[in-house]
Each structure stands twice: as C-alpha cells, then as structure tokens.
C-alpha cells in the first residue's frame, strides 16, 4: 500500500482533516521531513534558557543558557550553573576544590593533581585548586652522567672565583 | 473551503489547441500536486496529467508531447496546453486537487467542477 503522504514537503504535513493533501505547519510549529503526519511543537527557549536560532516551518528552534549557566545533554536540555575555577557544583551550590583537587573550568568536577611520581617524575611547580601540578624531570634525568640535550656546567673547585 | 473552477473548455477543429485553466482557492495551492483528467461519454475518467509543488511532471501515453501541464503559484492557478487536438479528445476535462503532493499513482482528494472541450 502506497503512502499517499510521503510528498508532502517539509514544513507541512499531510492533513487527514482534508482529504490528505498537504497543509502548512501552523505557528510555532514545524516539519523537518517530508511526509509528516503532524507538526512538532517549537522548543520554546524560556527561563535559564535563550535562543539561539529560531523556529521555522522546516525547523526547530535552537536554545542557548543565559550568562551564569552553561549547557548539558543533547541540544542544551538542561542548563547548569556555572563555578569559578578552583570550584566545583554541589547540591549546596559552588564549592572550593578540595586539597590535592583542581578544577581550571568553570563546569565540571574538581580532579585530582597529578602523581607526578607515578611516572618516576618529581614536582616542578605546585598544584592549585585551578591548576594542576607540573610534573619535572626524573631524579634520574638529574643525575650526573645522565644525557641532556645542553651538556651540564663544569664544576668549579670550593675556593675558586670564576675567572 | 477548498474550491477548484476550470475554464477555457469550448468547441475547437481537428489539430487546434486550447488552454485550460483551473483556479483555485481554500488551501495551500505551492505546497500540493494538482492534475487534469477527462471523461468521454460513456467512459471512465481518464488521468492526463499532473504536476507536484516542485513542478515535477507526469503524463498520460495518450497525451505525451500534445498535452503540457504547468502552474503558476502567484495566481493559484494550473494550467492545460492541449496542441494537435483530435476528435477523440472530446470530453469533460476536470482538475483535481492530489493527495499528499503526490503524482505518482495520484489520489484525488478534490474535483473541480469541469469544462467541457468538444
């Protein structure tokens, strides 16, 4: 059996009111296929929301978060509440990175610094609550006798002035 | 309400033309297909042709390269060049309103009144 709907354009939808022929979308609504039965409803952008495209008769509307929010799941569903770096959300609002955690975003949850000596490395520069440890060099990589690419500096006798 | 009202039907010799036109109202006229048909005395209404929003046609065998529809959106109206007519042409020619914007295996979901082409 053939699907006496499958023409009608996107924008419209094959209305069974009147005798199957194609009847444009009404307002705020839209089709984004060919051969719909019905129209969608537009997403409406309110609240914590803005929009960010707007509903046409071929297409959804598009919505944004407001400033202070930021966006979650597939096509901004949810809005959540930025943080400062240095912070993460809890159920009791922003809260300040825990000792040994970092967050450099304002979404997210705070991780945990490097180990740096996990890879045999040692701590080059402190970890905050933004920022993360970074990691030097190996005490091996220190050692004398160890290859670099700048040859190490002589070593100069106790007593002896530079000349 | 959705209105169909052809036009243009009359008396016409062998190898004349005529143009057929089809005005209507009461619906989305860009976005549906529309066709023409005829029904001879003692016959059963036969498809000529049909022409979709996109303006894509289809033509009957019995019409092809003498018949050619055509649509002109700003006026809501279609239209039927019929060329090198015969006697076997008489008939009562009607315009209808598809399903669907569809024109292939088309469904009629409206009918004019017809205009009679003798």
């Known amino acids: 059996l053939q699907d006496l709907c499958s023409n009608c354009p996107a924008g419209t939808f094959c209305d069974n009111n009147r005798s199957q022929i194609c009847s444009p979308c009404p307002p705020n609504s839209f089709s984004s296929a060919g051969g719909q039965r019905t129209c969608d409803i537009c997403r409406q952008c309110k609240g914590v929301f803005k929009t960010r495209k707007e509903c046409s008769s071929t297409s959804n509307a598009e919505c944004d978060c407001i400033s202070g929010y930021h966006c979650l799941g597939a096509e901004c569903s949810m809005c959540e509440q930025d943080c400062k770096q240095g912070q993460e959300l809890t159920k009791k609002g922003c809260k300040d990175c825990c000792f040994g955690t970092f967050n450099d975003q304002k979404r997210g949850i705070c991780r945990p610094w490097t180990n740096c000596s996990l890879d045999g490395k040692s701590v080059l520069v402190n970890g905050t609550k933004e920022r993360d440890v970074v990691c030097g060099p190996s005490p091996a990589d220190l050692s004398p006798g160890a290859s670099s690419a700048t040859p190490p500096a002589p070593a100069r006798e106790p007593g002896h002035s530079p000349q | 309400q959705v209105q169909l009202q052809e036009s243009g039907g009359g008396l016409v010799q062998p190898g004349g033309s005529l143009r057929l036109s089809c005005a209507v109202s009461?619906?989305?006229?860009?976005?549906?297909?529309m066709g023409w048909y005829r029904q001879a005395p003692g016959k059963r209404r036969e498809f000529l042709a049909a022409?979709?929003?996109?303006?894509?046609?289809v033509y009957a065998v019995s019409v092809k390269g003498r018949f050619t529809i055509s649509r002109d959106n700003a006026k809501n109206t279609v239209y039927l060049q019929m060329n090198s007519l015969k006697p076997e042409d008489t008939a009562i020619y009607y315009c209808?309103?598809?399903?669907?914007?569809?024109?292939?295996?088309?469904?009629?979901?409206?009918w004019g009144q017809g205009t009679q082409v003798t």
């Open positions: 022409i979709d929003s996109g303006r894509n046609t």
């Open positions: 009461g619906f989305s006229f860009s976005i549906n297909a």
């Open positions: 209808g309103l598809l399903k669907g914007n569809r024109v292939v295996s088309p469904s009629v979901a409206y």
